[in-house]
């Protein structure tokens, strides 16, 4: 669902974020502390353009625990 060149929009984007971020939750716009000024928000980046798993993970609310 998030291969190169594919777009994720609407409910598919919401569901994918919920899966990727799991219990961490997610933002549709990155918190200002983690965003550069040109950050567009995930709808812009994944629906209007295409995105990958790494980009999706940047919208999760807290970093994944490293084992």
């Amino acid at each position: 669902a998030y291969g190169p060149g594919e777009t994720l929009c609407g409910g598919e984007l919401v569901d994918t974020l919920q899966f990727v971020c799991s219990d961490r939750g997610f933002y549709f716009s990155r918190p200002s502390s983690r965003a550069n000024r040109r950050s567009r928000g995930i709808v812009e980046e994944c629906c209007f353009r295409s995105c990958d798993l790494a980009l999706l993970e940047t919208y999760c609310a807290t970093p994944a625990k490293s084992e």
């Epitope: 994720l8 567009r40 629906c47």
Partner: antibody, heavy 120, light 107 residues
């Protein structure tokens, strides 16, 4: 109150272009995406695309790629939809509609519609 | 592209009737299904979003249910102002697509 007011009816010849406007009021214009949907006479609803009024980014239905351009003017809280190379089957009522959230929960406020007639 | 199919169309009913309209998606769309009412010469009006959530200001006689591929819109007791055309719309992926509409007519 929240409302979207569209420009008036247009009559165009095949091959021409039309530009429809949609002026928003009663809410923060840049906080909601805006869709364009059309409806041919006696037919159903067809999604054309969406614009983010904040940055101006767009996403168009593949069917309209290359013929449609959606723009916005934040100073007047207005979005525009221009359709080029018009054909007779572009005759329709064109609506702007506000996105609820994330393209996932529908369109909650609609303009009154703009009738575009394409005829030679 | 996700295809949306509505039935029946048209639908004949009387005031006070319980009316059910169905909508089927060509693939699973989870609960990302919205319902609209449209009267002649007017813009559509959002009734139900996310399959079962009632839009603000919409009478409680309208309800929605379903998930995956099969959805229903129910009007518990049809009122004179409910005679209109109803459309379902999937918001799972783009292009956003609508059903063909169900016209609710007076029997």
């Amino acid at each position: 109150q929240v409302q979207l007011v569209q420009s008036g009816a247009e009559v165009k010849k095949p091959g021409a272009s039309v530009k429809v406007s949609c002026k928003a009021s009663g809410y923060t214009f840049t906080s909601y995406y805006m869709h364009w949907v059309r409806q041919a006479p006696g037919q159903g609803l067809e999604w054309m695309g969406i614009i983010n009024p904040s940055g101006g980014s767009t996403s168009y239905a593949q069917k309209f790629q290359g013929r449609v351009t959606m723009t916005r003017d934040t100073s007047t809280s207005t979005v525009y939809m221009e359709l080029s190379r018009l054909r007779s089957d572009d005759t329709a009522v064109y609506y702007c509609a506000r996105d609820v959230q994330w393209l996932a929960y529908g369109m909650d406020v609609w303009g009154q519609g703009t009738t575009v007639t394409v005829s030679s | 592209r996700i295809q949306m199919t509505q039935s029946p169309s048209p639908l004949s009913a009387s005031v006070g009737d319980r009316v059910t309209i169905t909508c089927r998606a060509s693939q699973s769309i989870s609960s990302y299904l919205n319902w609209y009412q449209q009267k002649p010469g007017k813009a559509p009006k959002l009734l139900i979003y996310a399959a079962s959530s009632l839009q603000s200001g919409v009478p409680s006689r309208f309800s929605g249910s379903g998930s995956g591929t099969d959805f229903t819109l129910t009007i518990s007791s049809l009122q004179p102002e409910d005679f209109a055309t109803y459309y379902c719309q999937q918001s799972y992926s783009t292009p956003l697509t609508f059903g063909g509409g169900t016209k609710v007519e007076i029997k």
